[in-house]
């Protein structure tokens, strides 16, 4: 979980405060619900989500609550606001569409079960920020060595559609990694700004696996991955040899 | 009581440097999210830059009209918010303000760029 | 970025009177994500009014906001000699933070 963890103590605190507070303070057992991920796909919404072990269990908590506080020096002493949205974000989640979301503030939310608070976490939503897969990864040929045992390709990909990219409220950095097929660890290549990128030196004769993610530059996480784009490299007959023409 | 005391402006030749101070008092300045707001004379308000707290990774951000020649920072142990302006222009004249997270502020300090 | 437009530029009013200022947003811009301030000559602004609605610390009650989407409002329900100054509206929900080009409140 990206973010500061806090406890209902914060409150007493410096209202702006996004620091941690004691854990002692907490009651949390590991049954108890916890937080697991807060995310946003692209700085205007986000969701957070939560185990919620105890009620498939013997222990009847009561109905799980989250509850949001955000802002600064003056709106941090007003009540907890209740999720607004239990449903969209699927089970144990609150989803905050864009009306709720402002990168410009930090939040604080809590789980209640019974009244009491059962977990707390504070953030501010570029922290949170972890986009959805690139999309449309297509490759091309870019060359062949003379000896036709290696060749170089191009991958190119599109952003997320969701990512605000011509305006530049989002800037994306992308991570590609690649492999052989029956290969288990994926080669990790720079991190880039571009949605295009050469490989270099593939085996002619093998079939390659290639997955692109990517993240909010400067802060946030590495999103999922996308679909796996499988490169074929056929045999060096099949190829026209550009040294062909001289 | 919140204060906020700006200091370090002046007059500058354009090209030149400056680096304005703001003293913090009465609050956490280590929990803050702090920022530079300016208002050029007889002007409106415009933002200028924001650094968060270490709980958020003193994260910074600039507005695009200063991206690349002004730096935010802050040392929390002297509770003092900093604004390193370099590559200075005649239309970063203007009254610099700091601000806890735009709430509460300073009474400015004024920075004229002029050859 | 969102610009913000505030009409009118200057009202000229009495000591007693209702005035009405406006802020109108190029894009939508959710309610909780609007303040207004109020700034007098050679002092900095005081922040007046949060989440479009809510008065901030130590500020009286005959000041009141409201609005939705693109379209806010400052109301001072009765001026007094005090309120005389110029007013912004501020957004910070999306692009960067953004200021009105304020709206002068001058006595009549």
């Known amino acids: 979980f990206s973010g500061s963890e806090a406890t209902a103590a914060i409150l007493s605190r410096a209202p702006w405060s996004l620091q941690s507070v004691n854990p002692g303070l907490k009651t949390n057992s590991s049954k108890e619900p916890k937080f697991t991920k807060c995310r946003s796909p692209e700085r205007e919404t986000f969701s957070c989500h939560w185990t919620d072990e105890v009620h498939h269990g013997t222990k009847n908590l009561g109905p799980i609550q989250l509850f949001y506080t955000r802002r600064n020096t003056q709106e941090w002493t007003q009540e907890w606001k209740e999720c607004p949205d239990y449903v969209s974000a699927g089970e144990n989640s609150c989803y905050f569409n864009s009306s709720f979301t402002s990168i410009w503030i930090p939040y604080c939310i809590k789980l209640t079960s019974n009244g009491g608070t059962v977990d707390e976490k504070c953030f501010s939503v570029d922290e949170i920020v972890q986009p959805d897969p690139p999309i449309a990864l297509n490759w091309t040929l870019l060359n062949v060595s003379l000896t036709g045992i290696h060749a170089d390709i191009q991958v190119r990909w599109e952003a997320p559609r969701n990512a605000d990219i011509q305006k530049g409220w989002m800037v994306l950095e992308y991570e590609l990694q690649y492999k052989e097929v029956n290969e288990t660890k994926w080669k990790m290549m720079d991190p880039i700004l571009t949605t295009s990128v050469p490989v270099y030196s593939l085996k002619v004769d093998k079939e390659y696996e290639v997955r692109v993610r990517s993240k909010q530059r400067n802060s946030g996480n590495y999103g999922e991955f996308s679909e796996v784009l499988y490169v074929t490299l056929p045999q060096m007959s099949q190829f026209t040899c550009e040294e062909d023409f001289y | 009581e919140v204060q906020l005391v700006e200091s370090g402006g002046g007059l500058v030749k354009p090209g030149g440097s400056l680096r304005l101070s703001c003293a913090a008092s009465?609050?956490?300045?280590?929990?803050?999210?702090m920022d530079w707001v300016r208002q050029a004379p007889g002007k409106g308000l415009e933002w200028v830059a924001e650094i968060r707290s270490k709980a958020n990774y003193h994260a910074t951000y600039y507005a695009e009209s200063v991206k690349g020649r002004f730096t935010i920072s802050r040392d929390d142990s002297k509770n003092t918010l900093y604004l390193q302006m370099n590559s200075l222009k005649t239309e970063d004249t203007a009254v610099y303000y700091c601000?806890?997270?735009?709430?509460?502020w300073g009474q400015g300090t004024l920075v004229t760029v002029s050859s | 970025e969102i610009v913000l437009t505030q009409s009118p530029g200057t009202l000229s009013l009495s000591p007693g009177e209702r005035a009405t200022l406006s802020c109108t947003a190029t894009?939508?811009?959710?309610?909780?994500?609007l303040n207004w301030y109020q700034q007098k000559p050679g002092q900095a602004p005081r922040l007046l009014i949060y989440?479009?609605?809510n008065l901030a610390s130590g500020i009286p009650d005959r000041f009141s906001g409201s609005g939705s989407g693109t379209d806010f409002t400052l109301t001072i329900s009765r001026l007094e000699p005090e309120d005389f100054a110029v007013y912004y509206c501020?957004?910070?929900?999306?692009?960067?933070?953004?200021f009105g080009g304020g709206t002068k409140v001058e006595i009549k």
């Open positions: 009465g609050f956490t300045f280590s929990d803050a999210w």
């Open positions: 894009s939508s811009v959710s309610s909780s994500y």
């Open positions: 989440s479009t609605s």
């Open positions: 501020h957004q910070y929900h999306r692009s960067t933070p953004t």
């Open positions: 601000t806890l997270i735009r709430d509460y």
